[in-house]
Structure formats: C-alpha cells, structure tokens
Interface confidence: low
C-alpha cells in the first residue's frame, strides 16, 4: 500500500513520542561518535518536518523517501569528515548506496568511555529535573554502544528504566529499589543485544534463505501445535521485520513489529495455547512477551517423519518441484518434536538431509541411497550432548569464575593472535553458559546450551572481523553459520602461533585494583591469565593455576597492607621473578 | 504466502453424504502430502485423513474408515474429503493441513450432522 509520504505514514502510525525515539536511535546508531545535543538538534528538525507532512502529504519534500530524508540530515553533521573519517564519503553518494555505506561504518566495538553510573541521588535529581532528557540520554548512550540493537526492544527497555525511577526515587531506600533493577536492566540488554547481533549477522553475512530456517526452526519448536502454512506466513513476517531493523529501517521495523504482535494475537487460537497473558499486555510489553513465549505442548500422536521423508516413493518428486519448501517442511516437522534439540542441531540435520537428497536425487536407486539418511542424524546429535554433558560437570566441579578461567585457556591456546580484551569478554560469556543452563533439566539443556553460545561465538566473529588477526577465526566465523561451534569445539593449540614478548608491565598491579568491584577484580586476573598463556601457550593447567593461585594471594595481602603500594611493588617484583620461573619463561 | 481454503461444508441429515473442497496456492501443491483434521465444539483437533503427494497412498482415523475418502487433483491444486454415511459425532469444523499436522491454520468449513 503506497503512502504519499512516507514520512508522514510512520509518524501517524508510530506517533510522536515513539517517531522521536526511534530516530533518535537510528542516529545514533550511524553516528556513534556526534554529542547527545547534535542528535536532538536533529530529530526535532526531523520531527517539526514529518509534522509538516502529515498536515500536508503533498508538501515539499514529503515524498522522498526515509532514506533519503535521514542521509541528507545526518550529512549536515558539520564535523562529519574530522570525526568519522572517510565514512563522510558516504555522502557523496546516491541512494540506496549512502544507506548501505553507512550500514559498512556501524563499529560493534566503538572507541566510546564506558559509562559509569551516578550516585544514584544525582541520577534521581537528573530524572525529576528534565524526565524526558533523562530517558533520551539513556535510548542515546545504549544505541550508540550497540548500533545493532533491535531498535523497538530499546524502546521496551527504555519504558523500564522509566518505571525503575519512578518507582525508586521516591522509595525510602532509593538505592536497595533502583541498583538491582537496573543491574538487570544492564544484563538483560548485553543479552538482547547479542542476540540481535546474531539475527542481523545471519541476514547480512549468509542472506534470507539461513535467517527464514533459523525462524522455521524456531517458531515450529515454540508452536509446534501450529500449522506449517502458520508457521510460514509467521517467518516471512519476522523476516521483514529484522531485515528492517538490520537495514536500519526503524521506522518501518517498529510499525512491523506491532502489526505481527497484533497479527499473532487475533491468531493465537492457530498459534499457540501459550500467548494469552502476553496478549492482554501493552504493545512494548506484548511483543517482548511473545518473543520470549515458553514452548506450546506437543501435539500428542504425531505419526513418524519417515513416511513422508524417507519411505515415500515421492521423496525426490517432491524435493525437485519444490526444494525450499519441502526442505522446509522438514525442518518444521523435525522441530515441533524436538523441542529439546537447540537450533542449530536442527538446520544441522536438515543440511544434512538437503545434502543426502542432492546426492541420492541423481543416484540410479534413490531410495536405497536415502533410506538411511536417519541413522546420519545420530553422531550430529550425540556430539552436543556429550559436549554439553562433560562441560557441564566441568562447571560444577569448578564453579563459574574458575569455569570462565578454563575457558579463557582453552580459547587462548586456540587463537591467541586474538586481542586480549575480547579473548576476556568472550571466554567469560562462554563461562556464563554453565550458570544460565547447566540447572536445566537434560531436556532443556541443549536450545539453552547451544543457541546461547552461538550468540556469544558471534560476537568474537563481529569483533574479529574488525581487526582481523587470526586465519582459524575467520575460517570457522565465514565456513557455516550453524558450524561454528563446532568449528571452534574443534580447534586444537595453535603450533603455528610463536609466543608473545615477555613484558613485566603486563603484570605490574597497583593499588587501585583493592578498590575495584569484585567482577573488576576477577577481570584483571583474567586479563594477567590471557596474557600468561600468550606468553607461555604450552603451560600445563597445574602450572597455571599455581600462578593464578599465587596472583590472588598476592592481591589480597596487598590490599589488606597498610602501604599498599609499596606492596603492590615490592611483592609484584617478587611475584613475576616466580612465575617466570614456574612457567620457565 | 502460504494458503488453504476449505468449501463444502453445511447442514446435513444423518445417514447424508457431503464433499469438502480444499482450494491451496502459493506452494507447489503436488509436492506434498495433506490432510483433514477437524475440530468438534469444546474439543482439541482431531486428525481424520491423510493422502500422499501423488494421491496413491491415503490413511484414515478409525472413525470414519470405510465412510470417508480423501482423494485430489495436483493440477487444479485442490484436496477433496467425500463423507459418506454422517453422522451426529462428526459434526465439526473441518480444516484442511500441509503434511501431518494436527492443527488449523485456516478458516475451515462448518459440518453439522443433525436431524
């Protein structure tokens, strides 16, 4: 349905206030760097102008499309070429081009300070001052940090944090109501953020067709009572949506998104026994709801796959007429009966399955070269689980710091040309997986397990690909999508990796680690233990944890003495003298 | 985008005969096997025929064996269900289903046996 204007059709669907939000984020998602008072300058001249619109459709300007009107605002930036360089380029070019250049320039680990919170009397000052400044300084300083975040959850977000100082600052004790909730608030947005890096990662780097068979596997798990007509007319719709968000086309990607909330709601009876309580909620609060929907019960009964796609004379008929579909099919019968599978084991099988049909297809007996394409499945399947199983016990015996230490090894001795900071930040993600999954029962274990460390192995791809350093990375990051893991699962030391310089001031600690929070400490030594293994990638796990073990001792004497400087210095000397003899450095 | 839509249905005496139409587009019909599934009031679905992609191969529930027949024709892209001998128990709304699946993803049709 064509609009006049475009501009003018979003904002009267959207209205005022989530029309400024979201143009908020998508500039400050392009440009990362520009102050918080240059990007409001921006949206409100947008804002005043998409008025003009609606009261005019026919006004000057009003056709042109989103694109255009965005780019040719941003490109007003006046220290556009001193502060992004040669993304100031951009604007030299036509549209579709400039949108896209601007897309290549969006930097996942931008060069920003990282934000430290207030006492939390300023910040409830700062919220009662100016409410609405307050909230957009929090939609400014998360987009820009995450420019790939899905732009209609941020505004979900932004309505808890809301609700937190509202509630909070006129609690008796501010800090014990606001401090957890916005703990949760900071960890459960590092999470949506990350799994909707992933989302955009699979639509830009391996097209449609991977992002659709993810969402058949998906949703055929969480609504396995569904049809499969359903549950493709469901994928097709979430597929513009986030190919929308990804693209940077908010605006749409927002009224999208409400369409298929709602769409899903007046269809739950076909969808899902599940969607009720979410339905009866706000839009913002309705499509987090049905995003994060528990799994419907499996229908009861449901016949063998095998007739249909192993023992049916008609198997390759009926790929060859239509091979998406069928596959497709497939992958919607084989996830609605295994919700205990993750994600990628599913579109693993069903590579497999497409791989079998391709071969056999051509074969001179088909259904002979095909017939056992099952018992295929078995080792794809078995590899997770014992993966899962053996890390699993790893963790309790260990629990999560020590867990995370492990992992921080393991991945170091992989791919140690990785920069150290991203080596941390994702070993200790991949750490979180034994904490947020290992408490599950067997039957949940692997979607928790698997997909979780798919959306963390993302992130060490994103990051990489930035500064790409390491051959084996790229390799397992570019191969498959859903290989990944194994890819990385797979690794072994890198013989070919010659160890790094040994450098003192890399293990020279001061006394300001005594006042750092206890994840701000655990950090530190991780980074000392990421760089221990750079330096000596053949030290065996004993001789590493005795150095860990003498590091923390070391900390904690120094930070209980009354000159803790001195300390740091006098014992730090002592310290790397008798690692470095440890380790025979 | 993916569509079905039944036809057919209605009022019928006991001991009636009707035929159920199932008009399908936007996927290659022939490729896949169908079925008939229905919903009497306050029920869960219930699975009631099912036919392979060339027709050659049918299966039914036990109630309503030797009674109905499911039959199509690829190239107008249509799925049938003759019901012969009806009776009170098989009032329902009848949907038709890609595959094997258990439940609607249509309107489906209202069939209502009563004297």
């Known amino acids: 349905d064509a609009h006049k204007s475009e501009v003018a059709h979003r904002f009267k669907d959207l209205g005022e206030e989530n029309f400024k939000a979201l143009v908020l984020i998508a500039f400050a998602q392009y440009l990362q760097q520009c102050p918080f008072e240059d990007h409001v300058k921006l949206v409100n001249e947008v804002t005043e102008f998409a008025k003009t619109c609606v009261a005019d459709e026919s006004a000057e300007n009003c056709d042109k499309s989103l694109h255009t009107l965005f780019g040719d605002k941003l490109c007003t930036v006046a220290t556009l070429r001193e502060t992004y360089g040669e993304m100031a380029d951009c604007c030299a070019k036509q549209e579709p081009e400039r949108n896209e250049c601007f897309l290549q320039h969006k930097d996942d680990n931008p060069n920003l300070p990282r934000l430290v919170r207030p006492e939390v009397d300023v910040m409830c000052t700062a919220f009662h001052d100016n409410e609405e400044t307050f909230l957009k300084k929090y939609l400014y300083e998360i987009a820009r940090r995450h420019p790939y975040f899905y732009a209609p959850e941020l505004l979900f977000f932004a309505k808890r944090y809301k609700a937190a100082f509202t509630e909070c600052c006129q609690a008796a004790d501010k800090a014990a109501c606001l401090l957890p909730k916005l703990d949760e608030l900071r960890d459960e947005g590092k999470a949506s953020s990350a799994k909707q890096r992933l989302k955009c990662a699979s639509l830009q780097k391996f097209g449609e067709r991977a992002f659709k068979a993810w969402a058949v596997a998906r949703l055929s798990q969480r609504f396995p009572k569904a049809e499969f007509a359903e549950v493709s007319k469901l994928v097709t719709d979430l597929t513009k949506v986030h190919t929308e968000c990804c693209h940077g086309d908010l605006l749409e990607c927002a009224d999208d998104r409400a369409d298929l909330a709602k769409y899903i709601c007046e269809n739950q009876d076909s969808i899902s026994s599940k969607l009720k309580e979410c339905c009866e909620k706000p839009l913002l609060e309705k499509s987090h709801c049905i995003a994060e929907v528990e799994n419907d019960e499996m229908p009861a009964d449901l016949p063998s796959l095998a007739a249909d796609f192993v023992e049916s004379k008609d198997v390759c008929k009926n790929y060859a007429e239509a091979k998406d579909v069928f596959l497709g099919m497939f992958l919607y019968e084989y996830a609605r009966r295994h919700p205990d599978y993750s994600v990628v084991l599913l579109l693993r099988l069903a590579k497999t399955y497409e791989t079998t049909l391709e071969k056999c297809c051509a074969a001179a007996d088909p259904h002979e070269c095909y017939a056992k394409v099952f018992d295929e499945f078995k080792p794809l399947v078995e590899e997770p689980q014992n993966l899962i199983k053996q890390n699993c016990e790893l963790f309790e015996q260990l629990g999560e710091y020590k867990f995370q230490n492990a992992l921080l090894v393991r991945y170091t001795k992989k791919v140690p040309q990785v920069s150290t900071p991203t080596l941390v930040e994702v070993s200790r993600n991949l750490g979180k997986v034994g904490s947020k999954c290992c408490k599950h029962p067997e039957a949940k274990r692997m979607p928790c397990a698997e997909d979780y460390l798919s959306v963390v192995l993302n992130q060490l791809c994103v990051l990489h690909e930035k500064t790409p350093v390491s051959d084996r990375v790229t390799k397992c990051c570019t191969e498959s999508l859903v290989n990944r893991r194994p890819c990385f699962s797979a690794l072994e030391v890198d013989e070919t990796y010659v160890p790094k310089e040994f450098n003192a001031e890399t293990f020279t600690f001061h006394a300001d680690i005594c006042t750092l929070s206890e994840k701000e400490r655990q950090i530190k030594k991780q980074t000392a233990l990421v760089e221990l293994v750079k330096h000596k990638p053949k030290a065996t796990k004993e001789q590493l944890k005795a150095v860990m073990d003498d590091f923390a001792a070391f900390v904690e004497k120094c930070c209980k003495a009354d000159d803790k400087e001195t300390c740091f210095a006098e014992e730090g000397k002592k310290l790397v003298a008798a690692s470095q003899a440890a380790l025979g450095l | 985008q993916v569509q079905l839509q039944e036809s057919g249905g209605g009022l019928v005496q006991p001991g009636g005969s009707l035929r159920l139409s199932c008009a399908a587009s936007?996927?290659?019909?022939?490729?896949?096997?169908m079925s008939w599934v229905r919903q009497a009031p306050g029920k869960g679905p219930e699975w009631v025929s099912a036919?392979?992609?060339?027709?050659?191969?049918?299966r039914y529930a036990e109630s309503v064996k030797g009674r109905f027949t499911i039959s199509r024709d690829n190239a107008k892209k249509t799925l049938y269900l003759q019901m012969n001998s009806l009776n009170p128990d098989d009032t329902a709304v009848y949907y038709c289903?890609?595959?094997?699946?258990?439940?609607?993803g249509s309107q489906g049709t209202q069939v209502t046996v009563s004297s």
């Open positions: 036919i392979d992609s060339s027709g050659a191969d049918t």
């Open positions: 936007g996927f290659t019909f022939g490729s896949f096997g």
């Open positions: 289903t890609i595959g094997q699946s258990i439940s609607r």
